[in-house]
Amino acid sequence: LQDPCSNCPAGTFCDNNRNQICSPCPPNSFSSAGGQRTCDICRQCKGVFRTRKECSSTSNAECDCTPGFHCLGAGCSMCEQDCKQGQELTKKGCKDCCFGTFNDQKRGICRPWTNCSLDGKSVLVNGTKERDVVCGPSPADLSPGASSVTPPAPAREPGHSPQ
């Protein structure tokens, strides 16, 4: 025997209390598939969340974050505070990257500068809190008579503060 509820389309629910007739989802609720026995409550985008897509009878609302925050998690389940470039978010708020680390985005953590010497390369441009070091050609690649500008001092080992 076919389940009578299977005939109920998205945007409706199969009403147990009314001989399994298909009733429309009430306001602030939705069913995105057919044959549902309940409509689900629409997500509400409040506080630091803002509505990216309104809820309809067949699809849930979608949220993003207000300016100064960015989405985290599946479907933007959380909003996390933005920091400036050169900072990372800690429990105590935005903090500058430690010496030897950088962050070139408004989110995420400070990452260690690239260690050019591991690839046998020299440091062409020193790293900052906002930018990674730029590695240049290996010293052996520098042809005789090339620019006599002294290359910048190598970056210190990543993650360590000055003594």
Partner: antibody, heavy 121, light 106 residues
């Protein structure tokens, strides 16, 4: 008869997590939504969120979005509520309650017996 | 969120007296549900969708109201009605409850 049986009392330290279970019997588990609520000592009722066991869809009180996780195991007709980063203010009796989503009136017609969670260092 | 405010917080009544508990919403709601809770027990479904008595609830109880004002009335109160009563809404997320009205029978 329709019954919701919850797991036993828990004592936890601040910062820990707790997972409370709610075993349903006497009805078709996937036809109803399962809600979680709490009641602090001498206080009123506060809604945490709900899960639709049929689809796994969850909807949370925004106050609990980042700390509560609701799940359901349809093979055992059991719903679970996990609350993380516990603090002393989370000391309360936690209830599961069934709602006949089919009525779309979101009314809690059957309640579990409650699980006391105490958060203390 | 919609705030529900019950009045009074506490009511003392004598048997056979008429008791009225009010639940006011900060914004208009479609309907209100009521629950009864006795000390040490879980809440019990009492009245759904403003006026529908739950199974086993005595007919001396009734519910009414619309918009932002709802009432639970006990026509001739009895000793067994001593409990705390809560109203609840879901017209807007999240579900919210009133703070409760404690009814004492002298």
């Amino acid at each position: 008869q329709v019954q919701l049986v919850q797991s036993g009392a828990e004592v936890k330290k601040p910062g820990a997590s707790v997972k409370v279970s709610c075993k349903a019997s006497g009805y078709t588990f996937t036809f109803y939504t399962m809600h979680w609520l709490r009641q602090a000592p001498g206080q009123g009722l506060e809604w945490i969120g709900y899960i639709n066991p049929s689809s796994g869809y969850t909807n949370y009180n925004q106050k609990f979005t980042d700390r509560a996780t609701l799940t359901a195991d349809t093979s055992t007709s059991t719903a679970y509520m996990e609350l993380s980063s516990l603090r002393s203010e989370d000391t309360a009796v936690y209830y599961c309650a069934r709602s006949d989503g089919s009525s779309s009136k979101w009314y809690f017609d059957v309640w579990g017996q409650g699980t006391t969670v105490t958060v203390s260092s | 969120e919609i705030v529900l405010t019950q009045s009074p917080d506490f009511q003392s009544a004598t048997p056979k007296e008429k008791v009225t508990i009010t639940c006011r919403a900060s914004s208009s709601v479609s309907y209100i549900h009521w629950y009864q809770q006795k000390p040490g027990s879980s809440p019990k479904a009492w009245i759904s969708a403003t006026s529908n008595l739950a199974s086993g609830v005595p007919s001396r109880f009734s519910g009414s109201g619309s918009g932002t004002s709802y009432t639970l009335t006990i026509n001739r109160v009895e000793a067994e009605d001593a409990a705390t009563y809560y109203c609840q809404q879901w017209s807007s997320n999240p579900f919210t409850f009133g703070q409760g009205t404690k009814l004492e029978i002298k």
